[in-house]
Interface confidence: medium
């Protein structure tokens, strides 16, 4: 087209441009190192760094880990991209008491409704259940279904929320992503398929590169990347996302290409001693008696940093279960991380990882 | 099995360049980023930089940069890591590396190393 | 850059001896750290990768612990084939660093 003329030859003769046929205009050349972030860059800040998969680019540019979802208690909300990290949720049924960035440090499941209450609002992944009185005359057994749900089979109503109870299998053998998902309830919605993308959005047949743009014609390769599960941090520099791989945590919020990824505590158990993205230091959410137990939507959506209690104090308690089970909470291994050494020694693995990711993915026997 | 084999030594004067090689063998070699690490004699390791074979893709430690030139052939499925103006300081050996590929992560530390090249710069 | 620092730089020890030796990050690296073995002559071998997971086929003898900035490698029943330069990586943030390396000697 000849009236495309005077806008190639606009790019002659300057080497940080160059024509791109397909949109017809002449495009910023992104330097050596530096990726587009769109088809035809028009200034330097159209360029960027380019993370491996699992890495984000931080706001200082550089390459940071992404937070995993590696908790039971959570799925991926959004994945690792190029400028965020992963983001955790709450997995269906249950909603967020303390968050944490980019994911969630303690989720309890939704509430049902006592007798005489009718659920105003359902629970969300960040809220509990929203109880009323029954309108007068109104059946038990609900005209409308949105509005009153029952406790399916019998169950006893709960008065608060009740924490999931952490795996008891061997967790600590599995590399990173341990641990069984509950009752692998949604599974397909929880384990990828071999061909399905991955959280890190990297094509199977791919599985250790991110995918990179293609430059335009004649830049070349000109975005920064970082090694997976490293985003670009604030400073420009490829920075691992931090890793929930210890039982006592789980995957808040995904490792993207510029956050990282965050961990909380599991259910039924509380940060102790914070840090950053995660927790250093999990202790189990104690047991209450009935009269003391506390309302969760006090904490509900705090960032709070919990100090351990004294010994034998309640500060927030899970009520005992109704059928008379001791929770979780009470087994040995959770009572192990209360110690005074707790917050420097951490819980270590004690035999290589298993054959199998709770993904279902292989994971490779190097010997 | 994965292995990475590198290239025999070499003796070069100052100021001359060198070209060291890394064959990858039992994985796809594109899958997977090649580090390359430096050890001079008697001392620790240093991370150099890494090239992204699928790509052509390199990010080096700054240290680095200008020093080394990363580049990588998928035909014959080997990383070359390229030593420039080389000095009395530039003798060490030189490693490739891999990262594993565990679980669902995949962070940068390294389950597979070549078996090094020993560069010597001497007159 | 992220300097961690090793120590002991050296140390003698005999058989069946247990030995700790430390890694210190110069900011919070959460547990993104590995430990690796080189002995005389030979490429480095991972030990310990996420700061306490032990690698397939590395003996139960090596134990990995810490996060934030405070990492240790524990070898129990020390062994005459441990014999060799220990060295803790951050690969939190890139550039990735190593420590100075901690020579251990047998007895």
């Known amino acids: 087209f000849p009236q495309d003329r005077p806008f190639e030859d606009t790019c002659h003769g300057n080497p940080s441009h160059y024509y791109d046929k397909a949109v017809r205009r002449c495009c910023y050349r992104c330097p050596m190192g530096l990726f587009p972030t769109q088809q035809c860059p028009q200034r330097p800040t159209d360029c960027r760094k380019q993370c491996e998969p699992d890495y984000y680019l931080d706001e200082a540019d550089r390459c940071t880990a992404c937070v995993t979802c590696s908790r039971d208690d959570l799925v991926e909300k959004t994945p690792c991209a190029w400028n965020s990290s992963r983001v955790c949720e709450c997995r269906p049924g249950m909603f967020c008491s303390t968050s944490a960035v980019n994911s969630c440090a303690r989720c309890f499941f939704h509430s049902v409704c006592p007798a005489g209450m009718i659920v105003k609002f359902p629970g969300t992944a960040q809220k509990n259940t929203v109880c009323e009185p029954a309108s007068p005359g109104v059946s038990p057994a609900c005209a409308s279904p949105e509005n009153c749900k029952e406790p399916s089979s019998g169950t006893i109503p709960q008065a608060k929320p009740t924490p999931v109870s952490p795996a008891t299998s061997s967790a600590s053998t599995m590399p990173v992503r341990g641990g069984t998902r509950l009752a692998q309830e949604a599974a397909s919605k929880l384990t990828r398929a071999p061909d399905s993308p991955s959280s890190v959005g990297r094509p199977s047949s791919d599985p250790g590169l991110s995918p990179t743009q293609p430059c335009p014609e004649g830049s070349g390769d000109c975005r920064k990347q970082c090694e997976p599960d490293y985003y670009l941090d604030e400073a420009g520099r490829c920075t691992a996302c931090v890793s929930c791989s210890r039982d006592d945590l789980v995957e808040k919020t995904p490792c993207a290409w510029n956050s990282s990824r965050t961990c909380e505590c599991r259910p039924g158990m509380i940060c102790a001693t914070s840090a950053t993205n995660s927790c250093a230091r999990c202790v189990p959410y104690p047991i209450c008696a009935a009269e003391t137990v506390t309302k969760p939507q006090d904490m509900a959506e705090k960032d709070t940093t919990f100090e351990a209690p004294p010994l034998g104090t309640q500060p927030d308690c899970n009520p005992t279960p109704e059928n008379g089970e001791a929770p979780a909470s009470t087994s040995p291994t959770q009572s192990l991380l209360v110690d005074s050494q707790a917050s420097k020694t951490l819980p270590i693995p004690t035999s290589a990882p298993v054959a199998l990711s709770s993904t279902g993915k292989p994971v490779l026997d190097a010997g | 099995q994965v292995q990475l084999v590198q290239s025999g030594a070499e003796d070069v004067r100052p100021g001359a360049s060198v070209k060291l090689s890394c064959k990858a063998s039992g994985y796809t070699f594109t899958t997977y980023t090649i580090h390359w690490v430096r050890q001079r004699p008697g001392q620790g390791l240093e991370w150099i930089g890494y090239?992204?074979?699928?790509?052509?893709?390199?990010d080096y430690n700054q240290k680095f940069k200008g020093k080394t030139t990363l580049t990588a052939d998928k035909s014959s499925n080997t990383a070359y890591m390229q030593l420039n103006s080389l000095t009395s300081e530039d003798s060490a050996v030189y490693y490739c590396?891999?990262?594993?590929?565990?679980?669902?992560?995949?962070?940068?530390?390294?389950?597979?190393w070549g078996q090094g090249t020993t560069v010597t710069v001497s007159s | 850059d992220i300097v961690m620092t090793q120590s002991p730089k050296s140390m003698s020890t005999s058989v069946g001896d247990r030995v700790t030796i430390t890694c210190k990050a110069s900011q919070n690296v959460g547990t993104n750290v590995a430990w690796y073995q080189q002995k005389p002559g030979q490429s480095p071998k991972v030990l310990i990768y996420?700061?306490?997971y032990r690698y397939s086929g590395v003996p139960d003898r090596f134990t990995g612990s810490g996060s934030g900035t405070d990492f240790t490698l524990t070898i129990s029943n020390v062994q005459p084939e441990d014999l060799a330069t220990y060295y803790c990586q951050q690969y939190h943030t890139y550039p990735l660093t190593f420590g100075g390396g901690t020579k251990l000697e047998i007895k």
């Open positions: 996420s700061a306490s």
């Open positions: 590396a891999r990262r594993a590929d565990y679980g669902n992560y995949e962070y940068t530390w390294f389950a597979y």
């Open positions: 090239i992204n074979p699928s790509s052509g893709y390199s």
